[in-house]
Amino acid sequence: DAHKSEVAHRFKDLGEENFKALVLIAFAQYLQQCPFEDHVKLVNEVTEFAKTCVADESAENCDKSLHTLFGDKLCTVATLRETYGEMADCCAKQEPERNECFLQHKDDNPNLPRLVRPEVDVMCTAFHDNEETFLKKYLYEIARRHPYFYAPELLFFAKRYKAAFTECCQAADKAACLLPKLDELRDEGKASSAKQRLKCASLQKFGERAFKAWAVARLSQRFPKAEFAEVSKLVTDLTKVHTECCHGDLLECADDRADLAKYICENQDSISSKLKECCEKPLLEKSHCIAEVENDEMPADLPSLAADFVESKDVCKNYAEAKDVFLGMFLYEYARRHPDYSVVLLLRLAKTYETTLEKCCAAADPHECYAKVFDEFKPLVEEPQNLIKQNCELFEQLGEYKFQNALLVRYTKKVPQVSTPTLVEVSRNLGKVGSKCCKHPEAKRMPCAEDYLSVVLNQLCVLHEKTPVSDRVTKCCTESLVNRRPCFSALEVDETYVPKEFNAETFTFHADICTLSEKERQIKKQTALVELVKHKPKATKEQLKAVMDDFAAFVEKCCKADDKETCFAEEGKKLVAASQAALGL
């Protein structure tokens, strides 16, 4: 499978359009501050070079690795040191260290302006004037803000983005057609980015074994009729795809993902009965569809797990012969029987089983020692079940906004050192679990909720890693991937925290709040709530709720006033003074 020229091989496999798009994504994910025009220039140079290699694979430099070619190209950027500081030192290194260096400098929270959506007519004009540039700009803006976005999936988003403009810019009411589609793409895009970020964190922080365990559990739930060998093959291939994408090898990743989709569709009879529709779609839609496909029905008469994994006299022998294979089989068998469990719960059960075998297979009477291992699973299963039940009840009682506020208070008290924007973003996302998952029946609630919470808590972990401020966050994030959520759930109020000094500026508001969207206004109020808790961590829920109601009354009053700015200035001072007096700020 060795090719004389890797770049020619990928260009031919992917085609010029996808090749150029993927190189643009790769470059934008590495050099997140570079202007669009600079990236386009670099991409065009790489593409022209690739074409010379397609014409003659023996041409000069065509035998170089993609990392060497792309790294050399990135290192030609003139302003590297001024713009990126120490990242410029990467260019002094040789491959593969240079690429590793670039990867380490990817910024999950780059200092980039918020993307402001222009008027619909302005967007449609730009789309019609230069469709290619318009779509490239979309790829560039998403990729630089989401440096771990799953590149082949971003191509699928770009295809949908193009389709939305093609359809809606001809519609009678362009805005009514286009805006809901763009909102949907934005929300799905954020979710997709966060899910992929967890996959990359899993691989990079916990290693291939952790990712493979996750993949065995998820694919076994999704394809319960597939044999273990088939699931193992899919896991191996999927691990390769995600390792490549997370490592910046986007061309190889996209190529291998296409091969995997092809393999799955050619072998769907031995994988899942739910793949038929997916496999009739074009490549990008097909891959997306497979990744989202619903769980197949469980085979009718699966035997009890106890026979092979508890009662058999060969348990320790089978375990000793091939530990990871045996544990993989346990995970496969348990997961295919439990689509109602979250993946992280299944992994906790497998870890408990592994720990028990490690201990018991060295004991005098192994069977006697591990005979009750399944009893140890009960509390592990009940903990997330109870937590989800309680939180769904709270969500149904409060609604999403107030549920988010309850979580904001809860998490600010747990980890008050974390920055306010991070606490607001993470708590808002945690709160979305309610509308996302609580509507589901019992059998679907846990996989929906706990696996979603894993994705959101990973956002907290990667943002915190950039500027660590809390030992408790570091501990929960690094000790165990599958126990992150229980670790955060178990945190109580941080009694060591010294309340933040009061700063009136933090609680100063202006008339611009009146023209904000409902979402932006909520974020302003939630930011104030976090700051309030940081100043007064001992305030009761009732006091915080009452102060927030005062804040709402203040905003409502001033937004109705003739002289809004004066009202905000004068009444704002009164609000702060009143809250100080009442809470002793």
């Epitope: 009732e542 006091q543 009452a546 009053k557 009164k574 009143a578 809250s579 009442a582």
Partner: nanobody
Framework: QVQLVESGGGLVQAGDSLRLSCAAS????????MGWFRQAPGKEREFVAR????????YYADSVKGRFTGSRDNAKNTVYLQMNSLKPEDTAVYYC?????????????????WGQGTQVTVSS
């Protein structure tokens, strides 16, 4: 269940003063803002004043600003409305209400529990 009982209404001359009281029982009084509203015959119920949970912040309708003062005594579970320089147009049934968990602070729909009202009549 929350109970609110207003008192202190009556018939007065223009320019006189009255002090309305509202005694509350039920859920924790100090956790919620309280509102005073009024309703004149044939008119909608209108906002008069909002007294916050701690009594440290009060908002008024423009029509009563400078003449009416709201206050509360959380130890006594009571909220007050001191009305000075009364005018004939202040004639109405005055209600006290306890804030709900959502909705506008200046609209009756944002308040959950209501008293039965006390009549205030200002003659010229």
């Amino acid at each position: 269940q929350v109970q609110l009982v207003e008192s202190g209404g009556g018939l007065v001359q223009a320019g006189d003063s009255l002090r309305l009281s509202c005694a509350a029982s039920g859920r924790t009084f100090s956790d919620y803002a309280m509102g005073w509203f009024r309703q004149a015959p044939g008119k909608e119920r209108e906002f008069v004043a909002r007294i916050n949970w701690s009594g440290t912040l009060t908002y008024y309708a423009d029509s009563v600003k400078g003449r009416f003062t709201g206050s509360r005594d959380n130890a006594k579970n009571t909220v007050y409305l001191q009305m000075n320089s009364l005018k004939p147009e202040d004639t109405a049934v005055y209600y006290c209400a306890q804030r709900g968990d959502s909705g506008s602070n200046y609209d009756p729909s944002g308040y959950r529990y209501w008293g039965q009202g006390t009549q205030v009549t200002v003659s010229s």
